[in-house]
Every structure is written in C-alpha cells, then in structure tokens.
Interface confidence: low
C-alpha cells in the first residue's frame, strides 16, 4: 500500500518496527514538501535480509524519475549498500520510498527505523542553468530565492534578467558619441534602448562606428535576438549585429533615431558610434587689417561663429558703431551673417580740460589716437601741479587718456600760495601809515555789504575759502543778553568777497567779485572774549589767480617773538578817517606774558589762541575795518609769506602799552585745514 | 530805473537777415554783460547769446551758431543782435536782458556773478545771471 | 538736457515739489506767470533765495537733482516754472513745469 506524506518532517518505520517486519510486504511512502525545499532522509536503525544485489529484502529510494539509493542488509558489502550514517537528499520536492520483504526470511530482520525533514534549497548556489539563474544578483530564503539588479539597471518582468531603461536618450549637439548601456562591458538583457538625434534644421548627420562592435548574432537568422536599428524619417537601415560595423552612414538628415533591442540572454561588448554635423560651406574669411578672427579654421560650416577682434589699441567699427568684438556667423545657405568689420584706431578724443592747467600735444598734427601722448602743466607762476605729477598721458588701448600715477583722473594744479608778483620796495602804516604798493598783498579780501560798503578784512586761503574774524559774521549783540544766535549771523547772501582790490572805494580792473557759498565759525569762538575769534568763508567760485589775487600760506610753526610781521586793511586812519587805498604797517610780535600784563588791568584775558604785536610806544595798530584782516610774515629762505593773524580786537587803536591782538592762525591751524582741505 | 527797450522784430521771411537793437538806460551799460534769451509761442524760456562788459568775449546758443552775431556799442549804450538765415523756428518773443553785476565774463569760466538783494527780479546760475529784462520784440518768421 | 515734469498741482496752504535734473552742479529757478511775462527768479544757486522772494519757496539739491519746494501754496503761486543751469559756454532752460493751485 502506498502512504502520502506532506509535512515538513517525519518518521518512516518498517512494518511492526521494532518488531521483525512481516514477509511479502510492500509499503511506499510518498513524501512532497513545498516548492524551494528539498528531502533529507536518514536512518536511525536499520535491519534488513542480506542478499545480492539486494534483490529479497530492500529499500528503495527514488524521485519521479530517478533511483537515489536502494538499501538493503545489516552492512555494506560489495554488492549491498546500508544507509549507516548516510544521508539521502532529493534533487526536488518530492521523494518515494518502498519498502519490500520476499515470502520468506530465513532469521528474523527488525526493518528499519528512518526519519525525513525538509531542507531549503540554496537556489542562488545550484542554479547552473542560465535560463533559470539570476543576471546579477541572487538573494537566498528559505523556501525560496529572489534576483536584483545593479545600480542604474531595473528587473525584468521576468523577475530574472536585469534591463536598463534606455529610451529616453537625446542629443542636440552637434558631435557626440552614443554608446550601448555599460560599454564596453556587456551591455544588458532585455533592454529597449532609443537614441535621438535632434539638430537644428540645416545639419546634416554623419554616423560611423567605432572601436568594438560585438551584438548577439545568429549564423542562420539574421539579427534574431539583439540588434541595432536607423531610423531616418521613413527610411529604416538595419538590423545590424555581429562583430563586423556597419560602413559610416551618411543620413541627409538632422533628426535620426537609433533602437537598441537586446533580449533575455548573451554577453556581448556592445557598440559605440560617433555622430557629426555637417552643413553647407562658407567662403574663406580675411581678418581685418589690425585685426583678427578667432577661432581660425581652414573651412566653415553652418552654425560655425567667429568673432572679429582688433589688435591692442583698436577697435572694431561696424556701421559706424565702435565695440569690442563683432561675432559673425555661418548661415545655412552656406553665407555670412555679416560682412568682416573694420578695425579703427583708438581715439581718445580732446583731453578734458584743467581747471588752471593747459596741455601741450607731444605728438604730431595733435594726435589724439592710441600711444599719443599729451602733457598738462599748471598755468604757471599762479598754480602748481599737486605731488609735482608729470603731467603725462597717454592715450590707453582703452580710450581714455592713462597717467602712470594717476590713471585716468586729471592732475590737480594747486594755487600758488604767498609768493607776489610784486615785493614792496617801503613800509607803510594803516592807523599812522602810508599806502601799500599795489599787488604786493594779493591775499587780502575785503569783506563787503551789497551796496559796496567795506566792513572787514580776510585773507585767501587756497582756491575758494577766505579766513577771518568771526566777529565780522554777526551783528553786535545785546550787552543784556549777549548770547550768540544763528539770527545774529550774516547770511551767506548779505555780503561779498572783493579780492585783488587796492582802492577801498573806487574800483580797478583787477577786482574779483565773488558770492558766499556757505560761513564757519569756529565751534570754541566766544564773541564775549573774544576767543577762537576766527571764521572760515567758502566762496561760491574760485577766483582767477593773477598777479592781484593769489592765496596766503598757512604758517608751518609757532611765530618767534620779536619777529617782524605786515598787518594789511582798509580800516580807519587818524581822526576815525578811513583811507583811500589799502594801508600797511610793520610791527613787531610781542612776547605774550608782555601782552597778558597789558591788558591785566583791563580785565581783559589774552588766552593761547591769540598773538600780540606792536611797539610800546604805540602809533602802528590795526584800526576799526581792519578786523578779520591778514598778519603776515616774510620767510626770507623760502621767499614766501605766511598767515600769522587776523585783526581781531585791542583798547582803542595805537595806544601806548595797548597791544593789537590778533586771532593766532598757528592755534587753529588743524580746524582751519580740516574745514578747508587747504595744504600749504 | 533800468530799462531796456528792443526793436526790430516784426514779420521776417524764411532765408532772410534779421536785426534787433536793444536800447539801455538806468545804469553803467559798459559794465554790464548783456544777453539775448527767446520764448517760442507756446514754449519755453530758451538763450540765445551772450556777450562780455567789453565786447571781448562772446558766446551762442547750438541752435544758432553761425548764423547769429551779438555786438554791442558801449558808448550808444545798445546791444545788437544780427540773426541770417531765418528759419520758422527762430519765430518767438526777443528778450534783452542785464546782467546781475558788474564784471561778470565769459572770459573766464569760473568767474560768478551774484545777484543783489534790490528787490528786483533777477535769474540766477552758475555762470551767468540776468536780473533786468526788456518787454520783449516779436519776431514772426513766415513767406 | 534738463528734465522737469510738465505740470503738477497743488491744494491752497498745501506743499508741492518741482524737480530737475540734468548735469549740472549749480541750478536756478525761475517763475514766469503769463507768456510774454518778465520772468522772476525764485532760487538761484540751488539753495539760495533773493531777498524779493517769500521763504515759503526753498531749493534744495542732492546728486545732480534739483527740487524746489513751495510750501503753503497760494491762488498766486500759479505760473510756469523753469529750472536752469549754465556750463562754461551756454545757459540752459528746462522745458518747464506748470503749477496748478486747486
């Protein structure tokens, strides 16, 4: 009889185990396990009649179609076969085993005691067959295997085979290379690969093969399982496999399509081809004179761009229009978008004018093109050029006009300070003076009402500023409430610069009238004492500087005592008169305790930021006018004058042992050149 | 007072000459700089020409450079402007104006002139200013 | 060039703005009331204003733009405003801007 078995493990015994088996018997025992798993048998006890060939007695183990092992015996002779320690594996899930004894047995034989498990198949490891086996990667479970792919491949359908997703693959410039997936290793399985080639409409593309090409073929069929496909338009060429390349292939065509097909199985290297463009020819281009066109080729094609570009100290000009470059390009009618353009020398153009300064050509006919050079020089003896700068420049490749230390900024001529055309052959006084010679002061201002009246003095510091006493920018105040308010101050619209004047109230040619842009006061001026009594006025335009006009030095130290000083104005003479011309005294400075005892019982303080001169015995002294007006003084190394003063107050004018006391420039000297930017 | 009286304008033909005279009073004319300014019917203020206190230095505006000529005759106290080549668009009202003070010039170009707190109207700039005005001649150019 | 907006408008007792531009660094402003009008200068020299003139007008200047502010705007502040400037060889008008007062 024939029992089934169907669980994962069992026992199988002879008939009336542990018992002698009965004869004439005959049990088969079929035992089947899930799929992925296979049948280990073994035997604990076994006892069976001996005979040759095991022909009386025996066990028989067998699949469908196959006999694993036929048993029979107490132990292995030469033509009978014991289990022992023997284990009986089925190549399947399915396993039969027969039991049989003859009509007699000669002893008694106890059977056999055997036991059956199932045992999972390792699939990934027994696998042979390629069919049947994973392309890439085998997985192992109990009961059954799995198969995966590398990176970048997907698993077929098929669950077995690894494809590549291929089919979405453009190009759209004008050479390239396509390749199989995985070149030159073997391409993979299974896969549908396309290749477009999309360009512009007017290419034309070439293909050609390269390198290895190595598709599954077949000596019969031709291109049955991989193969290449062209598609030009309606056209298609191929199939194409094996090991020998297709010849190049021309398309006539800007839009092709490649297909790839691959099936399930081979390990073949693949293909690579390489695509150009080609289009219709342009005639031979000639690079401008001073020029030239980039890239240079021997022949130009459609699409082909050069661009034009001119040697150093050119430009290119094209319709009238100067620039840098000028890209032309290969139509598809195999004509130039353009004509080459020209290339012109540079031209920087007329040099922009200086302020106070001329220029001189040094090359010919007044060049003004690329290497020219020119030279700016200050307009001498009145101005002169700022860190002594050569003056030289030249016209760049860049258009502008280039100075080695200045780059393309303008040099500056800076106003001559303190050196008159004039020098004073006698002295003179203002209060008990004589007039001063005309041009020998041409620093001095006069400070005056619209209507033309004079009221103060200055000095011409630089180009645009005038430095005098702060006093002589507000309105007396109130001695009840003596505080400085900005409605005491005069508005820059209420009064006037003259300068290069001489007579105070007729007028010259030389005179200068010049508006106020803006007043200064110094921050520390206290109009009660008189201290910081110094102003700073901008003027709205710079004055032209002549022998008349020029500006003041500003003192390099301190005033040495003793030091002869000029003291100019136009303020009052004797009996409260006021002079025809300008006047002028020499006096001496005065020691300051001197002055300081002077005006002690005054009550009056003489603080640091003032300097005192004048004789003992009085008579020279600046006078009611005079205020904000110039001290100044001759160093005789350098031949040039210096700011000491302004005119600021005393008690009375010309007193015996009643100094003038004048506001010291040298104290204010880093306010006055903060406010001014004036350097010496 | 200031006046400044111009004549000369009237109905002009296309190609043809024009002459204005501007006739001064009130004050120094020969310290003066002087300048013609224009007002297109319709439009806006617009300079024509300009001229220093001595007569050394002049200037024009674009439009009618080469075809203009300021002069003046400090001792008649007139100011004159010559205009060739008539165009349509010379048509419009012919101020002569004053300068603010004294001195102002060409000659130099950062010379300022400053206007004076008389009162009177004056116009401003950088370079130039004028604060009195004539009533204006009426130049019609028309075939 | 000088470049002004054509026309602006403002309520009685209210603010208005002008402004120009151009390239100059020194600019006036001048009031014409009728066509054929002596002309009137309100501010000169950007900031500055002539003593004739009302404080309610004022100019100011930042970069090369020029404003002129009336501030309390009166029925007889109705007229065309010119701005304008002069280089080393010319002066120049802006088009002008015409004030309407509401």
């Known amino acids: 009889h024939t029992v089934e078995l169907n669980n994962m493990f069992g026992q199988i015994q002879s008939p009336g185990y542990p018992d002698s088996y009965p004869s004439d018997s005959e049990v088969t025992w079929n035992i089947t396990v899930p799929d992925g798993f296979r049948i280990k048998l073994y035997f604990m006890h076994f006892n069976l009649e001996s005979s040759y060939l095991c022909e009386y007695d025996y066990v028989k183990v067998e699949t469908e179609d196959q006999v694993l092992a036929t048993f029979c015996g107490r132990e292995t002779t030469d033509t009978e076969q014991t289990p022992g320690q023997e284990v009986v594996l089925s190549p399947g899930s399915f396993m039969s085993i027969t039991f049989r004894s003859d009509f007699s047995n000669e002893e008694r034989f106890t059977g056999f005691d055997a036991h059956y498990m199932a045992v999972d198949v390792d699939e990934c490891k027994e696998r042979e067959d390629e069919e049947l086996s994973c392309d890439h990667y085998c997985h192992n479970y109990i009961g059954g295997y799995y198969c995966s792919c590398r990176f970048g491949y997907i698993l077929h359908t098929d669950n077995r085979t690894c494809r590549v997703e291929c089919s979405d693959n453009l190009f759209t410039q004008r050479t390239g290379v396509i390749t199989s997936p995985d070149f030159p290793n073997p391409y993979p399985k299974s896969s549908e690969c396309l290749y477009t080639i999309e360009l512009e409409e007017g290419f034309m593309v070439n293909l050609q093969f390269e390198d290895i090409f190595d598709i599954e073929d077949h000596p019969e069929v031709p291109c049955p399982y991989d193969y290449i496909k062209i598609k030009v338009g309606p056209k298609v060429l191929g199939p194409f496999c094996g090991e020998k390349a297709p010849e190049p292939i021309s398309t006539q065509s800007h839009s092709v399509l490649i297909l790839f097909h691959s099936d399930n199985s081979g390990e073949n290297r693949g293909w690579r081809l390489s695509y150009r463009a080609a289009g219709n020819e342009c005639p031979e281009l000639q690079p401008p004179v001073h020029g030239k066109i980039e890239p240079s080729q021997a022949k130009y094609f459609f699409k082909d761009q050069v661009l034009v570009s001119c040697d150093t100290g050119y430009k290119v000009l094209k319709d009238n229009v100067e620039m840098d470059t000028f890209q032309i390009e290969c139509l598809k009618d195999g004509t130039w978008s353009n004509k080459i353009p020209t290339c012109k020398i540079v031209d920087c153009r007329a040099p922009g004018e200086l302020e106070h300064g001329l220029i001189t050509f040094s090359t010919r006919n007044n060049l003004t093109t690329y290497k020219s050079e020119i030279k700016y020089s200050c307009q001498e003896p009145y101005y002169k050029m700022l860190n002594n700068n050569t003056g030289i420049y030249t016209c760049s490749a860049q258009g502008v006009w280039m100075n080695k230390v200045l780059g393309r900024s303008l040099p500056t001529c800076l106003p001559v300070c303190g050196l008159p055309k004039f020098s004073r052959k006698l002295m003179a006084r203002i209060f008990n003076g004589r007039p001063a010679q005309k041009g020998t002061t041409p620093w001095i201002a006069m400070l005056s009402h619209l209507n033309g009246q004079p009221f103060c003095g200055g000095s011409l510091l630089g180009s645009s500023w005038i430095v005098t006493a702060a006093h002589c920018l507000h309105q007396s105040l109130d001695p009840e409430d003596p505080t400085l308010r900005d409605s005491d101050l005069l508005s820059p619209s209420d009064f006037k610069i003259i300068l290069g004047k001489h007579w105070r109230l007729r007028s010259d040619e030389n005179e200068q009238h010049l508006g106020v842009k803006h007043t200064t006061l110094h921050p520390q001026y206290d109009p009660n004492t008189f201290e910081n009594d110094v102003a700073l006025v901008e003027l709205l335009e710079s004055p032209v500087l002549n022998a008349f006009v020029m500006p003041i030095c500003l003192p390099e130290g301190p005033q040495q005592e003793g030091a002869m000083v000029i003291v100019s104005g136009w303020g009052k003479q004797f009996l409260q008169r006021f002079p025809e011309t300008l006047m002028e005294i020499e006096i001496p400075i005065v020691d300051h305790s001197t002055c300081q005892k002077a005006y002690a019982p005054l009550k009056k303080k003489v603080t640091r930021d003032m300097i005192c001169a004048g004789e003992k015995e009085g008579g020279k002294d600046a006078c009611a006018g005079d205020s904000g007006g110039p001290m100044v003084t001759l160093n005789r190394e350098r031949g040039q004058w210096y700011l000491v003063g302004t005119v600021s107050w005393g008690d009375d004018c010309g007193k015996k042992d009643r100094y003038g006391v004048y506001s010291y420039i040298h104290h204010n000297k880093d306010w006055i050149q903060r406010v001014t930017g004036v350097r010496n | 007072a200031v006046t400044l009286d111009e004549s000369g304008g009237g109905l002009q033909t296309p190609g043809g000459a024009l002459s204005l005279v501007c006739k001064a009073s009130g004050f120094t004319f020969s310290s003066n700089a002087m300048g013609w300014v224009r007002q297109a019917p319709g439009k806006g203020l617009e300079w024509v020409a300009g001229i220093d206190d001595d007569g050394s230095g002049t200037r024009y505006a674009p439009a009618v450079k080469g075809r203009a000529t300021i002069s003046r005759d400090n001792g008649q106290s007139t100011l004159r402007l010559q205009l060739n080549n008539l165009r349509a668009e010379d048509t419009g009202t012919y101020y002569c104006?004053?300068?603010?003070?004294?001195?102002?010039?060409?000659?130099?170009?950062?010379?300022?002139?400053?206007?004076?707190?008389?009162?009177?109207?004056?116009?401003?700039?950088?370079?130039?200013?004028?604060?009195?005005w004539g009533h204006g001649t009426e130049v019609i150019v028309s075939s | 060039a000088l470049t002004q907006p054509s026309s602006v408008s403002a309520n009685p007792g209210g603010t208005v703005k002008i402004t120009c531009s151009g390239d100059s660094s020194y600019y006036g402003w001048y009031q014409q009331k009728a066509p054929g009008s002596a002309p009137v200068t309100v501010i000169?020299?950007?900031?500055n204003r002539p003593s004739n003139i009302p404080s309610r007008f004022s100019g100011s200047k930042s970069g090369s733009t020029a404003t002129l502010t009336i501030t309390g705007v009166r029925a007889d502040d109705n007229a065309v405003y010119y701005c304008?400037?002069?280089?080393?060889?010319?002066?120049?008008f802006g088009a002008g801007t015409t004030l309407t007062v509401l």
């Open positions: 104006a004053k300068t603010c003070e004294p001195g102002t010039t060409f000659k130099d170009k950062c010379n300022t002139c400053r206007c004076g707190s008389d009162g009177k109207s004056a116009f401003c700039t950088r370079k130039l200013c004028y604060q009195a």
């Open positions: 304008a400037s002069t280089d080393s060889s010319s002066t120049a």
């Open positions: 000169y020299d950007n900031t």
